[in-house]
């Protein structure tokens, strides 16, 4: 969480941002909130990016003002106009690109004053893993697949029964480049599994951590998946 305060001159207002991550090819949110103000016509929201000459986005006098917008963001940004009244200046970024990563500044002007806060935005690819029993294998085998990751993650297997056990000797992980030549499909196979046990396939890079669990018993198979972004720090 980054909390920024205003600049000298007018009274300062508090602006708060939250570091976040964008999944390339999908839409992302850059979070920013400020002290709401009743005089809506005076509210100006500017999003800037370090190293970029033009603006990422500008909202003033109740509408988008995009004449100064940088080419790389053309047609890809929007604020939530109905949320500005409650102090939400978050930016929607469409079709996140790898090059969107960097330091952004959320700069706010209201009738009460000015304020800004920076936000670190990471970009990559992350997806939920699915763990299945591989019935084609010669021994009891589990197959963990996740369609899109970048940068290349690590994959670790764990088991509820054999806690702390190292499964690297009985597992095999491969990374297959997807058609857009950036993200990769992750496939990890775990051999010699036993029934009545819960196995977890944990995939992690510097942006996200995802876990796929599978519990195999004689009568049923239960699955669960979970994904967590690692860098959600507020400013």
């Amino acid at each position: 969480l980054i909390i920024g305060f205003g600049i000298s001159g007018r009274h300062s207002i508090t602006v708060t941002t939250v570091a976040s991550a964008g999944n390339i090819g999908e839409d992302g949110i850059l979070s920013c909130t400020f002290e709401p103000d009743i005089k809506l016509s005076d509210i100006v929201i500017q999003w800037l990016k370090e190293g970029v000459i033009g603006l990422v986005h500008e909202f003033k006098e109740g509408k988008d003002e995009l004449s100064e917008q940088d080419e790389m963001f053309r047609g890809r940004t929007a604020v939530f106009a109905d949320q500005v009244i409650v102090g939400n200046a978050s930016l929607r970024l469409k079709n996140v690109q790898l090059t969107d990563a960097g330091t952004y500044k959320c700069y706010i002007i209201t009738s009460k004053g000015k304020g800004n806060a920076n936000l670190e935005y990471k970009t990559g690819a992350f997806s939920m893993p699915e763990v299945n029993v591989d019935y084609n294998a010669s021994s009891e085998t589990l197959r963990c697949e996740a369609p899109r990751w970048f940068p290349q993650p690590t994959v670790v297997w764990a088991s509820q029964v054999d806690q702390g056990a190292n499964f690297s000797e009985v597992s095999n992980t491969s990374f297959e480049l997807n058609s857009e030549n950036v993200t990769m499909k992750v496939v990890s196979v775990l051999y010699n599994v036993t029934i009545n046990n819960t196995y977890s396939c944990m995939i992690e890079n510097d942006i996200a951590k995802a876990t796929g669990d599978i519990k195999v018993t004689e009568s049923e198979i239960k699955r669960r998946s979970h994904l967590q972004l690692l860098n959600s720090k507020a400013s």
Epitope: I38, K39, L40, S41, D42, I85, V86, G87
Partner: antibody, heavy 116, light 107 residues
Framework: QVQVVQSGAEVKKPGSSVKVSCKAS????????ISWVRQAPGQGLEWMGG????????NYAQKFQGRVTIIADKSTRTAYMELSSLRSEDTAVYYC?????????WGQGILVTVSS | EIVMTQSPATLSVSPGERATLSCRAS??????LAWYQQKPGQAPRLLIY???TRATGIPARFSGSGSGTEFTLTISSLQSEDFAVYYC?????????FGPGTKVDIK
Amino acid sequence: QVQVVQSGAEVKKPGSSVKVSCKASGDTFSNYAISWVRQAPGQGLEWMGGIIPIFGITNYAQKFQGRVTIIADKSTRTAYMELSSLRSEDTAVYYCSRGGPYFDYWGQGILVTVSS
Amino acid sequence: EIVMTQSPATLSVSPGERATLSCRASQSVSSNLAWYQQKPGQAPRLLIYGASTRATGIPARFSGSGSGTEFTLTISSLQSEDFAVYYCQQYKKWPFTFGPGTKVDIK
């Protein structure tokens, strides 16, 4: 000096509609939101919805969705709130106020009585 | 929606005494909270916004504090004109919601 002036009291039959108005002085329409808040006899305050003329946005409380319409006429600096399918529980004083997110100037209120 | 609760429902205070009114939100509203005063037959009047900022023309005896889910309105020394109903209102999220009110009457 900011002034918010509302129309007069109304008596309506159940099932009918009521349209009440609110005229604001000064720069209210070009700079602020206009909200409608009602108060049933002996009860508390209830936000019904609001309009932000400069943003071109209206927002209604879920409870009134589909029954309430708020519009603003910038040329006459007048906001209107229409409530349809009236029932006896809609008997209340209806206030127009400058604002959202909070409300700094209020009209005098309009008593709308719904009775057969 | 965010539900606002106020306590007590009625507060009986003697003139010159201090009055402390509480308001609680069902989830965090940060400092996005306002307080209003309403006298019988009149429209509400804005006292405090931003949890602690006095509105224009509001006497210094009115003060607001708190953030997140717990808020307090304090009237340091009650004057005869302060006997009224007080409402809190959150504006963190649409729809804006009011508390049920606290009536401050003469002891």
